[in-house]
């Protein structure tokens, strides 16, 4: 998957809302530093971004795979082995709205806690209306079948 020329959508995960958009004077800069915005805080920020960025990457992968003009290139990349084999299945399960309940109540919570957390977050964002309309469209059109098959066929140890 290329990371170039891909517009970011709904990915910002703000760790702090203290800074104004405009450039502050040095006094405000000192205040910000006293609050702590250095490497340890940045590391925490990156931790919070990691799972969300992966979902965003998956969404962009799905969007590009649905682009007919790019399908030939996609197949070539599959043949080259440079396209992660689990992306398609992961995305369909990750984003399948009708699958959330099963994940939360069934073995999903027990065996796949990280994935459940992400799916639950997607559900929350749907509930409060903060998730993109585009994702709604994708969710409505994705089936859970492939993801179920993938869960059954994939050993937990292979994914951890």
């Amino acid at each position: 998957r290329s990371l170039q020329d891909t517009e970011e959508k709904s990915r910002s995960f703000s760790a702090s809302q203290a800074d104004p958009l405009s450039d502050p004077d040095q006094m405000n800069e000192d205040k910000r530093h006293s609050q702590g915005t250095f490497t340890s805080d940045y590391s925490k920020y990156l931790d919070s971004r990691r799972a969300q960025d992966f979902v965003q990457w998956l969404m962009n992968t799905k969007r590009n795979r649905n682009n007919i003009a790019k399908r030939h290139d996609e197949f070539e990349r599959h043949a080259e082995g440079t396209f992660t084999s689990d992306v398609s299945s992961y995305l369909e399960g990750q984003a399948a709205k009708e699958f959330i309940a099963w994940l939360v109540k069934g073995r999903g919570r027990r065996d796949f806690p990280e994935e459940v957390a992400i799916v639950e977050e997607l559900g929350r964002r749907h509930a409060d209306g903060s998730f993109s309309d585009e994702m709604n469209t994708i969710l409505d059109n994705l089936a859970a079948r492939d993801f179920i098959n993938w869960l059954i066929q994939t050993k937990i140890t292979d994914r951890k």
């Epitope: 990371l3 170039q4 020329d5 891909t6 517009e7 970011e8 959508k9 990915r11 910002s12 703000s14 760790a15 702090s16 809302q17 800074d19 104004p20 958009l21 405009s22 910000r32 915005t37 490497t39 940045y42 590391s43 920020y45 990156l46 971004r49 990691r50 799972a51 960025d53 992966f54 965003q56 990457w57 962009n60 440079t82 990280e114 994935e115 994914r159 951890k160």
Partner: antibody
Amino acid sequence: QVQLVESGGGVVQPGRSLRLSCAASGFTFRTYGMHWVRQAPVKGLEWVAFISKDGSDKYYVDSVKGRFTISRDNSKNTLFLQMNSLTAEDTAVYYCAKESILAALFDYWGQGTLVTVSS
Amino acid sequence: DIVMTQSPDSLAVSLGERATINCKSSQSVLYSSNNKNYLAWYQQKPRQPPKLLIYWASNRESGVPDRFSGSGSGTDFTLTISSLQAEDVAVYYCQQFYSVPTFGQGTKLEIK
């Protein structure tokens, strides 16, 4: 075509200030985090500062804390780095870099602007 | 911070031959939730900025020739150029983006 063009570098005396700019084009500037990365002959590549897409989050390497300020003007597609109390250790080529979808990964870099701190 | 160490510091390879550059991180950059290694490789030619080649340890960036490949997991990684071309002469850097970004010291690749 993504383009990042830095300006504002030059020779400056220790203790003085300098303001770097980075003009961005070819992508939707307001939807990406941006970084400053510097390259000194002795220290190699070193990440300096990050600003989130809307400017709400800013982070700095410890060595520039309290001296450097990163900011952006999304209406003008421009990134800034205000550098105060400069020392010889700040001498480097300063690159502005666009963040990819993945945090802290740099998919485009500017050509860089040289900052020399010398008396 | 995570310390990145590359080897060798410099490398001379004949045209058409394989070039291998190693990178070691002081701690794991593997994110278990998605099984991705947060390791990137950049190429920097003289008087040019770095260019992204590989991300997630093995994913080639768009437009990068398929002679470039990345491998490894956890703390040990390798960049391989399967058949060296004249235009591949450059300094190559690894970078971890799991935590606060840090770079290796660089490996200078030359033609033998």
